[in-house]
């Protein structure tokens, strides 16, 4: 019997599996870029925003050249799970100022969940362990103010955008080596 309805049919070709993950990552990247631009229009950002609870960007000079598929998938999945938590938190605790972006944040969350499912599928196909985060999960408290939630949204979308770029570049680079 085939896969249950609604679940993606996975080929036996790891390049095709990677392709599928890259496609979802690129779609999510485009959504994130669009939402980040909307955020900047509605709530202009004054400089770079950061949030201590966000994962550190995985890529640094020199790391892309030495990437291995298990490391990329594991790191990406852990980081995206963190971003999913942050998007959920933003939708829950973002306050009235972010309510106008609720449909877009909801769509972003759905895309993130879909990409995470695809990565999980790819990892099980490659018999990779479904790694849990290294660090303990920091509970996310409510933002200190309306401006605090806006700054947090800028930081989350900016970080996700860069993480997804790292992911697309890493996955496509690995595909050339398969």
């Amino acid at each position: 019997p085939g896969p249950p309805a609604g679940s993606p049919r996975v080929s036996s070709d790891p390049r095709a599996d990677l392709d599928s993950a890259v496609l979802l990552t690129r779609s999510l990247l485009a959504d994130t870029r669009q939402l980040a631009a909307q955020m900047r229009d509605k709530f202009p950002a004054d400089g770079d925003h950061s949030l201590d609870s966000l994962p550190t960007l995985a890529m640094s000079a020199g790391t892309l050249g030495s990437l291995q598929l298990p490391g990329v998938l594991t790191r990406l999945r852990v980081d995206l799970m963190s971003y999913l938590r942050h998007v959920q938190w933003l939708r829950r605790a973002g306050g009235p100022s972010l309510k106008t972006l609720e449909p877009e944040l909801g769509a972003l969350q759905a895309r993130l969940e879909r990409l995470l499912r695809r990565l999980q599928l790819l990892m099980s196909r490659l018999a990779l362990p479904q790694a849990a985060p290294d660090q303990p999960v920091i509970p996310l408290g409510p933002p200190a103010s309306a401006w605090g939630s806006i700054r947090a949204a800028h930081a989350i979308l900016g970080g996700l955008h860069l993480t997804l770029d790292w992911a697309v570049r890493g996955l496509l680079l690995l595909k050339t080596r398969l």
């Epitope: 392709d19 890529m59 790391t63 770029d165």
Partner: antibody
Framework: EVQLVQSGAEVKKPGASVKISCKAS????????MDWVKQAPGQRLEWIGD????????IYNQKFTGRATLTVDKSASTAYMELSSLRSEDTAVYYC????????????WGQGTTVTVSS | DIVLTQSPASLALSPGERATLSCRAS??????????IHWYQQKPGQAPRLLIY???NLESGVPARFSGSGSGTDFTLTISSLEEEDFATYYC?????????FGQGTKLEIK
């Protein structure tokens, strides 16, 4: 106005290295990747590689791996491409170009730097 | 690497005429609604200029007489009514996989 301004023309001997700079202005430098493209006389445009200015993480076309080195100076909004072990086939115009994250299309280009390799 | 072949290599037309430039990929550069083909214009002594991205999206500031279409392996750049400043060389480029590659170009000349 969004601009990429490249360093001037270079004449080099075979075996030498060249380092080209690309100064970005008019946009947030870390919001886009910086790509480098070669255009040799009579040849098609060739992608050399790109670098994410936020992290300094480069990727390369396999053809240029080991000879091209991409770096950035975030504080100066400047990207650099160094090409080593130059040979006559490296005679070309080299462009830096602003790349959309994850999509590799190039919406802003530098004016180009001509590199001539000759003994 | 994906190879892009442009045709014709050169094309001589008059201002006001319609130009149709073709770009064929050695394998599909489309996937689930996205086509990773982009078009550039280049004039002698100048850098390339982005006209169309992701097959059919007009870059900001580019005149509406330029349009892009196609999917899979076959793509077209159309200039509906040629203006004097449109005579140049046009390149297609893909970004489906790494490395991105360019076509060899189509030179559009005044008849």
């Amino acid at each position: 106005e969004v601009q990429l301004v490249q360093s001037g023309a270079e004449v080099k001997k075979p075996g030498a290295s060249v380092k080209i700079s690309c100064k970005a202005s008019g946009y947030t430098f870390t919001d886009y990747n910086m790509d480098w493209v070669k255009q040799a006389p009579g040849q098609r445009l060739e992608w050399i590689g790109d670098i994410n200015p936020h992290s300094g993480g480069p990727i390369y076309n396999q053809k240029f791996t080991g000879r091209a080195t991409l770096t950035v100076d975030k504080s100066a909004s400047t990207a650099y491409m160094e090409l080593s072990s130059l040979r006559s086939e490296d005679t070309a115009v080299y462009y830096c170009a602003r790349g959309e994250l994850g999509h590799w299309y190039f919406d802003v280009w530098g004016q180009g730097t001509t590199v001539t390799v000759s003994s | 690497d994906i190879v892009l072949t442009q045709s014709p290599a050169s094309l001589a037309l008059s201002p006001g005429e319609r130009a149709t430039l073709s770009c064929r990929a050695s394998k599909s550069v489309s996937t689930s609604g996205y086509s990773y083909i982009h078009w550039y214009q280049q004039k002698p002594g100048q850098a390339p200029r982005l006209l169309i991205y992701l097959a059919s999206n007009l870059e900001s500031g580019v005149p509406a007489r330029f349009s892009g279409s196609g999917s899979g392996t076959d793509f077209t750049l159309t200039i509906s009514s040629l203006e004097e400043e449109d005579f140049a060389t046009y390149y297609c480029q893909h970004s489906r996989d790494l490395p991105p590659t360019f076509g060899q170009g189509t030179k559009l000349e005044i008849k």
